[in-house]
C-alpha cells in the first residue's frame, strides 16, 4: 500500500481516468480519448486535451494591434490527430477526407483541401496575444498590480516560466497578455505557451481543467477581475498560407 494508492488523481487534468496499478504500484492517469498516461505534475498538451474533450460525453495602448498574419481560432472544436508525443500533427483531416494544416496550437493555417494536401512541418506558434475585456469596475486597476497578478497566475497556476510572459498591457477595460516562446528558447520540461494559453482560456470560461480546484478567482488588490470577453491571436514563426479569396471575404 503506497502513497500513490491513497491519492491517485491527476491535479492538472481532470479529463483522465486514474488507477494505482502502474509499475511499482505507481498511480497512472490515462487521458480520455487517447489513452496516454499523462504527466500530472505539469500541463497536458492541448492536442490530448482536445481529443479528451471530443471523447467526453456531450452533456455535460500601449495596446498591441495584432499582426496581419495573426490567426484566430474560428473553426471551433475538432477531434485532432496527435503525434507520438501528444502534440498536434501538422496535417489534420476530418471524416469526410477534408484536410488542412495546423500550427503548434492546433489552429488552421491553410485553406482546406483534400487528402493530397501536404503539410511539411508543424509550424511553431511563437507569439500569443490574449486580449481580454473586464467587466466595469469602480475605477481602473493599477497597471503594475495587474501586471504582477497576471504574471503570478501564469507562473504558479500554469507553471509557465516568467520569461515567456513578454508583456501585460492595460487600457481600461482592455487587458492584453503577450506570451512569447521561440523554438530555441523552449527547454525540455518547459510548459508550452500554447498549452498555458489553452488552460487560461478554459479557466476564464469557467471550464477549469484542473482536478478539484475551484474555478479561477482572479483578484487585483482584493478587487475581483471578471472577464466578459476573450480573444486569442496566434502568431506563427512562418506566416500562414491562405488564398486571397479568404482574405478579402
Amino acid at each position: 500500500h503506497t502513497a500513490a494508492q491513497d491519492n491517485c488523481t491527476c491535479p492538472t487534468n481532470k479529463m483522465t481516468v486514474c488507477s494505482p496499478d502502474g509499475p511499482g504500484g505507481r498511480c497512472q492517469c490515462r487521458a480520455l480519448g487517447s489513452g496516454m498516461a499523462v504527466d500530472c505534475s505539469t500541463l497536458t498538451s492541448k492536442c490530448l486535451l482536445l481529443k479528451a474533450r471530443m471523447s467526453a460525453p456531450k452533456n455535460a495602448r500601449t495596446l498591441v494591434r495584432p499582426s496581419e498574419h495573426a490567426l484566430v481560432d474560428n473553426d471551433g472544436l475538432y477531434d485532432p490527430d496527435c503525434d507520438p508525443e501528444g502534440r498536434f500533427k501538422a496535417r489534420q483531416c476530418n471524416q469526410t477526407s477534408v484536410c488542412w494544416c495546423v500550427n503548434s496550437v492546433g489552429v488552421r493555417r491553410t485553406d482546406k483541401g483534400d487528402l493530397s494536401l501536404r503539410c511539411d512541418e508543424l509550424v511553431r506558434t511563437h507569439h500569443i496575444l490574449i486580449d481580454l475585456r473586464h467587466r466595469p469596475t469602480a475605477g481602473a486597476f493599477n497597471h503594475s498590480d495587474l501586471d504582477a497578478e497576471l504574471r503570478r497566475l501564469f507562473r504558479e497556476r500554469y507553471r509557465l516560466h516568467p520569461k515567456f510572459v513578454a508583456a501585460v498591457h492595460y487600457e481600461q477595460p482592455t487587458i492584453q497578455i503577450e506570451l512569447r516562446q521561440n523554438t530555441s528558447q523552449k527547454a525540455a520540461g518547459d510548459v508550452d505557451i500554447g498549452d498555458a494559453a489553452y488552460y487560461f482560456e478554459r479557466d476564464i470560461k469557467g471550464e477549469s481543467l484542473f482536478q478539484g480546484r475551484g474555478g479561477l478567482d482572479l483578484r487585483v488588490r482584493g478587487e475581483p477581475l471578471q472577464v466578459e470577453r476573450t480573444l486569442i491571436y496566434y502568431l506563427d514563426e512562418i506566416p500562414p498560407k491562405f488564398s486571397m479569396k479568404r482574405l478579402t471575404a
Epitope: 505507481r26 498511480c27 498516461a37 500530472c40 505534475s41
Partner: nanobody, 120 residues
C-alpha cells in the same frame, strides 16, 4: 522528434510465442525508461512491462512469468518476448518512452503499435 516503430506481431496459436521489437530514434534511448502497452478491442490501454534505463523490470500480475522485456542500447531497440500466449493477450501492442515519478507512471511518447492475435 521521437519515433517508435514496432514490429513482430501476428497470428499465433494459444500456448505459442512471439517476440516483438521496437526501433527507437529521436532521443537518447540508453538513458530512457521504456515500456510496452497493449490495448485490447473495446478496452483501455494497459502497461504490460516496464524497463528502466538501468535494466530494472516491472510486470503486472497478468503477464508475470510469461512476458520478458529487454533492451539492446547498441541497437536502440526494445524487445518483448511473449510466451504461453492466451486468447486474452490479443491486442495492439505499443512501445512507449516512459518514466516513473515519485507517485506516477508517465508515457511521454508511444508508437503506432503492432497487432497480436492469439487464436486457434
Amino acid at each position: 522528434q521521437v519515433q517508435l516503430q514496432e514490429s513482430g506481431g501476428g497470428l499465433v496459436q494459444p500456448g505459442g510465442s512471439l517476440r516483438l521489437s521496437c526501433a527507437a530514434s529521436g532521443f537518447t534511448f540508453s538513458g530512457s525508461d521504456m515500456s510496452w502497452v497493449r490495448q485490447a478491442p473495446g478496452k483501455g490501454p494497459e502497461w504490460v512491462s516496464y524497463i528502466t534505463s538501468g535494466g530494472t523490470t516491472y510486470y503486472p500480475d497478468t503477464v508475470k512469468g510469461r512476458f520478458t522485456i529487454s533492451r539492446d542500447n547498441s541497437k536502440n531497440t526494445l524487445y518483448l518476448q511473449m510466451n504461453s500466449l492466451r486468447a486474452e493477450d490479443t491486442a495492439v501492442y505499443r512501445c512507449a518512452k516512459s518514466r516513473l515519478t515519485d507517485s506516477h507512471y508517465v508515457e511521454d511518447a508511444w508508437g503506432q503499435g503492432t497487432q497480436v492475435t492469439v487464436s486457434s
